[in-house]
Amino acid sequence: MRWCLLLIWAQGLRQAPLASGMMTGTIETTGNISAEKGGSIILQCHLSSTTAQVTQVNWEQQDQLLAICNADLGWHISPSFKDRVAPGPGLGLTLQSLTVNDTGEYFCIYHTYPDGTYTGRIFLEVLESSVAEHGARFQIPLLGAMAATLVVICTAVIVVVALTRKKKALRIHSVEGDLRRKSAGQEEWSPSAPSPPGSCVQAEAAPAGLCGEQRGEDCAELHDYFNVLSYRSLGNCSFFTETG
């Protein structure tokens, strides 16, 4: 039995309206999403705030059933979609090889006992590749220009600081030469030695840190934040709900 992590995306996160006041559960969905033609997308819903037992989850398009995950029977994919639809992650559904015709409403329907049926709605817009490519063509040079600007600024700062320190070092060398000779056993601080805190070498490294490590930490935080529950999928489709 595989354990899959249920990803609930922040963008477009919303609560679906419920059919009855007696039903306490809420469905969170990915809301309105867009994807590139030929690409893939994960449709996700999450039922929370109810102790009802989930017996089946349906994934439906406007006029057809895409897939079902039944507590007893496991996953079943529509024969029409078996080449383009993959179950999971979790109780979600992955749509592959997207076409413009895939644009439209998608529904996740949770069949529960004793509450009844909870429905979530997701609107998917599939964009032509050229739209995404145009965006990329615009963004890449922009990022390149920003990076180049940072490099130039940082290089200039390094040069200025290095020259300033060299001048200081020369002055110190000429005025206090004998003091340096007395402390010859101590490590000299020169531009070639490791830079102290606050120097431009660290500042130069900062853009890489911000664009690399920092972003990675952000991603890890988001990953940890949204992957709060794990779901058993495929096999017998065990369902869990969060009662908080």
Partner: nanobody
Framework: EVQLVESGGGLVQAGGSLRLSCAAS????????MGWFRQAPGKEREFVAS????????YYADSVKGRFTISADNAKNTVYLQMNSLKPEDTAVYYC??????????????WGQGTQVTVSS
């Protein structure tokens, strides 16, 4: 394959009511929607009403709107057609249909054997 069995047909006077039932069996998890069609003598089979199995959305032919009501009991895998204010032109064989994976409004994959409804004037 999904099997469908209708019941509830019969003879009724104009203005009267009837309730048709259709029980589904087999791999009912694959049902997208269920509904009713009818075929009057010498005419083509026509759509009457349907309901999306899981969401409860309902659709009706203009000729029956306001008089017929379709409903479903998912727990019993049964769909019902409540027919009120019946007219002689409602006389026909009523067929239950199940759209397996796809909507029966596009292609009805499974059919019941039909039940006769006769409205006398």
């Amino acid at each position: 394959e999904v099997q469908l069995v209708e019941s509830g047909g019969g003879l009724v006077q104009a203005g009267g009511s009837l309730r048709l039932s259709c029980a589904a069996s087999g791999p009912t998890f694959s049902i997208y929607d269920m509904g009713w069609f009818r075929q009057a003598p010498g005419k083509e089979r026509e759509f009457v009403a349907s309901t999306i199995w899981s969401r409860g959305d309902t659709y009706y032919a203009d000729s029956v709107k306001g008089r017929f009501t379709i409903s479903a009991d998912n727990a019993k895998n049964t769909v019902y057609l409540q027919m009120n204010s019946l007219k002689p032109e409602d006389t026909a064989v009523y067929y239950c249909a199940a759209g397996v994976w796809s909507s029966l409004r596009h292609t009805a994959a499974n059919w019941g054997q039909g039940t006769q409804v006769t409205v006398s004037s």
